[in-house]
Interface confidence: low
């Protein structure tokens, strides 16, 4: 919309807006929307919630079609029904330490999650949780067959994770990224987000990325073989283009998306990859987005909305991302 | 009670225009705006257009250069005109009120012919 | 332009509840594609149900509402009844223009 023209809204009355969503007039001051929460993507006719004091974020200046709504400098966090002030630490439970920042919250699992192979003195590891202990820990189960401590060696590594890598320590700064978050939705276009002070100040920063976990037109359970639960990773069909509030990306990409679970499991992004991705808007504006890229999706249990809010939180969280 | 009489004519020769009239009653112009929609076998509903509250008016980018709406907020009319008229562009055109579309006129049967 | 597509045909009995969806080929369907939804009866009949996504016309009955379902407007009828056996359409709102369903034909058993 023009803002220099008349006003087009086309509904009246003004549409109603889900409990605790602000109805407010949109960038031109003509019509009245339902604002846009923290996270989702946001344009001049659809503004943020100022009463919760988001605003657009464009990030590059070539960007200034759409943007993500976030929460103004120093806005607090509200996690799991406690208020922390913007840069203030927390640890949610023995396993993890948060950050808040900006309205946002990133955090970072204080247990290792290293995978320890078979090594000659402990042929046989697993993990088990410990009375009295938060974190679960490495057990060395006796063999019950000596002979199979030969082939079990090919496979030996030390993948000890006990202290900050060194790579991650430059200048005076620890350099600490939360994992990215899980897709704000769970089919069609959404947004994934982390903190992270890697960058020349060592200043924390939130950073964004568009995410698409699976099309919401796929029916995807046709494709379930019988007697399966499960499609982790369906077969790409065909190239696909992908599209952002009427923008299309230049080129198209063959893209996985993660599947579904027939047996109450949720089908999520595993390993994932962030590139940049390319919009052309109708008007001829061309604007460049990162975007998650699924390499692996994995079926488990930590479906959102579990009761424990940050262990279903954090493991629905995308790991091994190479950006 | 809201009412949208429609007034035009029935048949038009191709290359000529088609001027229809709109008079709206139960509500009023400067506080709804009036959509153009025309209803034709092979293409269903088909937007064509609308005259805003404001005075501001869009069209169908399909239409754009041989169409055009305007009204009288005193008068409560609304006009409107498409040139250029072809065979296919036989239809029923309606005028319905913005907000849902939710009263519209009785319609105007065009029939294109030479 | 965009097309925005619509189940063809939808059979229901008195009483039951159908859901009707409107898809648009450039995206998710959002609150600023204002969706509305149209009932034609026989002899070109037009009223119009639902307007800015959720929003009853004046005198529509509560069995019709209209809302975001996925990424698609959706228009459910709960507790339909003979005089909603009809044709239905959705349109869309593009920042500059509508675009209409091709309609979907309910028909109440």
């Known amino acids: 919309q023009n803002c220099s023209g008349p006003c087009r809204c086309p509904d009246e009355p003004a549409p109603r807006c889900p409990a605790g969503v602000s109805l407010v007039l949109d960038g031109c001051g003509c019509c009245r929307v339902c604002a846009k929460q923290l996270g989702e993507l946001c344009t001049e006719r659809d503004p943020c919630d100022p009463h919760k004091g988001l605003f657009c974020h464009f990030g590059s200046p070539a960007n200034r079609k759409i943007g993500v709504c976030t929460a103004k400098d120093g806005a607090p966090c509200i996690f799991g029904g406690t208020v922390y002030r913007s840069g203030e630490s927390f640890q949610s439970s023995c396993k993890y330490q948060c950050t808040c920042l900006d309205g946002a919250v990133g955090c970072m699992p204080l247990c290792s999650m290293d995978v320890r192979l078979p090594s000659p003195d402990c042929p046989f590891p697993r993990r088990v949780k410990l009375p009295g202990k938060c974190c679960e820990e490495w057990v060395c189960d006796e063999p019950k067959d000596q002979t199979v401590v030969g082939p079990a060696l090919a496979a030996y590594r030390l993948e000890d994770t006990f202290g900050p890598d060194p790579t991650m320590i430059r200048a005076n700064c620890l350099v600490q990224t939360t994992e990215w978050s899980a897709c704000s939705k769970t089919c069609g276009m959404g947004i994934s987000t982390r903190v992270t002070n890697d960058n020349a100040s060592c200043r924390l920063e939130k950073q964004s990325r568009l995410c698409m976990v699976r099309p919401c037109e796929a029916d995807l359970e046709e494709n379930i073989k019988k007697g399966k639960k499960c499609i982790r990773t369906p077969k790409i069909s065909k190239p696909i283009k992908f599209e952002l509030s009427g923008c299309t990306s230049m080129k198209t990409y063959r893209a996985k998306f993660c599947g579904v679970c027939t047996d109450g499991r949720c089908c999520t992004p595993h390993r994932t990859t962030t590139l940049p991705v390319e919009f052309k808007c109708p008007d001829g504006e061309v604007m460049k987005k990162n975007m998650m890229f699924i390499k692996t999706c994995a079926c488990h249990y930590n479906c959102p909305g579990d009761n424990d809010i940050f262990e279903s939180l954090y493991y629905r969280k995308m790991y091994g991302d190479m950006a | 009670q809201v009412q949208l009489k429609q007034s035009g004519p029935g048949l038009v020769q191709p290359s000529q225009s088609l001027s229809i009239t709109c008079t709206v009653s139960?509500?009023?112009?400067?506080?709804?705006?009036v959509h153009w929609i025309r209803q034709s076998p092979g293409k269903g509903l088909e937007w064509l257009g609308v005259?805003?509250?404001?005075?501001?008016?869009d069209y169908n980018a399909a239409f754009m250069s041989r169409l055009s709406i305007t009204k009288d907020n005193s008068r409560s009319h609304v006009f409107f005109k498409m040139t250029s008229l072809q065979t296919d562009d036989s239809a029923i055109y309606y005028c319905?009120?913005?907000?849902?579309?939710?009263?519209w006129g009785q319609g105007t049967t065009l029939t294109v012919s030479s | 332009q965009a097309v925005v597509t619509q189940e063809s045909a939808l059979t229901t009995s008195p009483g039951g509840t159908v859901i009707l969806t409107c898809r648009s080929s450039?995206?998710?369907?959002?609150?600023?594609?204002?969706a509305n939804w149209v009932q034609e009866k026989p002899d070109h009949l037009f009223t119009g149900l639902i307007g800015?996504?959720?929003n009853r016309a004046p005198g529509v009955p509560v069995r019709f509402s209209g809302s975001l379902i996925g990424d698609k407007a959706a228009l459910t009828i709960t507790g339909a009844q003979a005089e909603d056996d009809a044709m239905y359409f959705c349109?869309?709102?593009?920042?500059?223009?509508?675009?209409f369903g091709g309609g979907t034909k309910v028909t109440v058993l």
């Open positions: 319905a009120r913005d907000g849902g579309f939710d009263y």
């Open positions: 139960g509500f009023s112009l400067t506080t709804f705006g």
């Open positions: 005259i805003w509250r404001r005075g501001g008016t």
């Open positions: 450039i995206g998710a369907v959002t609150t600023s594609n204002y």
């Open positions: 800015g996504t959720s």
């Open positions: 349109a869309l709102w593009y920042s500059t223009h509508y675009v």
